[in-house]
């Protein structure tokens, strides 16, 4: 049966934790990503800048993860306007301002 | 200025009841959830309980749970803890305090009053 | 319920830097907020939403929240910083507020 969208919103948050917990060496080699506005359309847009990172196992279930959040495919080089112009950060810092971000979300009861 | 004024507190025997009152101004008060803390002497703050910014729903804490009821009027905007079968271990000050109102309550309380003390004892 | 862990006492000296825990399983999926009380004051919030800072609240009051630990960092402390700070969260399985233990922060 199909997962509730509070669970797995929830499941997605606790990744996230364990990822920025686990941090021992940079993540992902320091990787950049395109920064993303927060406001709107969230987790297609945090899929498709963390899809352009490759072999990365750590973020591997992450972007699973947001796969099943996002309505339509998602593949490497693509861009929606939600993209901050211009503007890159490293993974671990995109990690931890998603992670805030959807912590406010769930408290806020928009788990889709 | 936005304020939140609390009063009813005093001496009251174990076993009896008191209702303390928490009088709200300069703010929306029907915008925001409410709370109780209070705090026994010499110890930390402790959660007594929330009621949702329309009233329509409450939780406490398992210490206060079946005891005490926190109610408001949001016309006269007010919030009230009525607190019944009071033992020695409910002595404490008493703060109100409020939080913008979530689907869940977990906002931080930005307001809070500045306390009155309650003293069980026989 | 929801066990928040907080040292009981910190000392600094001022103008260093002075670092406030708060441990709880998995405190990193939750929101982390934290006041100040000092003696015979209602507390004060000084950290919202694990790092975000109120207005009136110096720019030397930092919080972060990772895995099990909230951290509340004041740096280049001042004598007027002494008080109690409290950590809190909404456990959401119990729907009850929970605050960690407190910690009285001394300037030496």
């Known amino acids: 049966s199909p997962v509730p969208p509070s669970t797995a919103l929830k499941e997605l948050i606790e990744e996230l934790v364990n990822i920025t917990q686990n941090q021992k060496a940079p993540l992902c080699n320091g990787s950049m990503v395109w920064s993303i506005n927060l406001t709107a359309g969230v987790y297609c847009a945090a899929l498709e800048s963390l899809i352009n990172v490759s072999g990365c196992s750590a973020i591997e279930k992450t972007q699973r993860m947001l796969n099943g959040f996002c309505p339509h495919k998602v593949s490497a080089g693509q861009f929606s306007s939600l993209r901050v112009r211009d503007t890159k950060i490293e993974v671990a810092q995109f990690v931890k301002d998603l992670l805030v971000h959807l912590k406010k979300l769930f408290r806020e009861g928009q788990f889709n | 200025q936005m304020q939140l004024v609390e009063s009813g507190g005093g001496v009251v025997q174990p076993g009896r009841s008191l209702t303390l009152s928490c009088a709200a101004s300069?703010?929306?008060?029907?915008?925001?959830?409410m709370h109780w803390v209070r705090q026994a002497p010499g110890k930390g703050l402790e959660w007594v309980g929330v009621i949702w910014d329309d009233g329509s729903n409450t939780h406490y804490a398992d210490s206060v749970k079946g005891r005490f009821t926190i109610t408001r009027d949001n016309s006269k905007n007010t919030l009230n803890l009525q607190m019944n079968s009071l033992r020695v271990e409910d002595t404490a000050v008493y703060y109100c305090?409020?939080?913008?109102?979530?689907?869940?309550?977990?906002?931080?309380?930005?307001?809070w009053g500045q306390g009155t003390m309650v003293t069980v004892s026989s | 319920s929801y066990i928040l862990t907080q040292p009981p006492s910190v000392s600094v000296a001022p103008g260093q830097t002075a670092t406030i825990t708060c441990g709880g399983n998995l405190i990193g999926a939750k929101l982390v907020h934290w006041y100040q009380q000092k003696p015979g004051q209602a507390p004060v919030l000084v950290i919202y939403?694990?790092?975000d800072r109120p207005s009136r609240i110096p720019e030397r009051f930092s919080g972060s929240n990772i895995g099990n630990t909230a951290t509340l960092t004041i740096s280049d402390v001042e004598e007027g910083d002494e008080a109690d700070y409290y950590c809190?969260?909404?456990?959401?399985?119990?729907?009850?507020?929970?605050f960690g233990g407190g910690t009285k922060l001394t300037v030496l």
């Open positions: 939403d694990d790092s």
């Open positions: 305090a409020r939080a913008p109102q979530w689907y869940l309550t977990a906002e931080a309380f930005d307001l």
């Open positions: 809190q969260v909404w456990d959401y399985s119990s729907d009850h507020m929970v």
């Open positions: 300069g703010f929306e008060f029907r915008t925001y959830g």
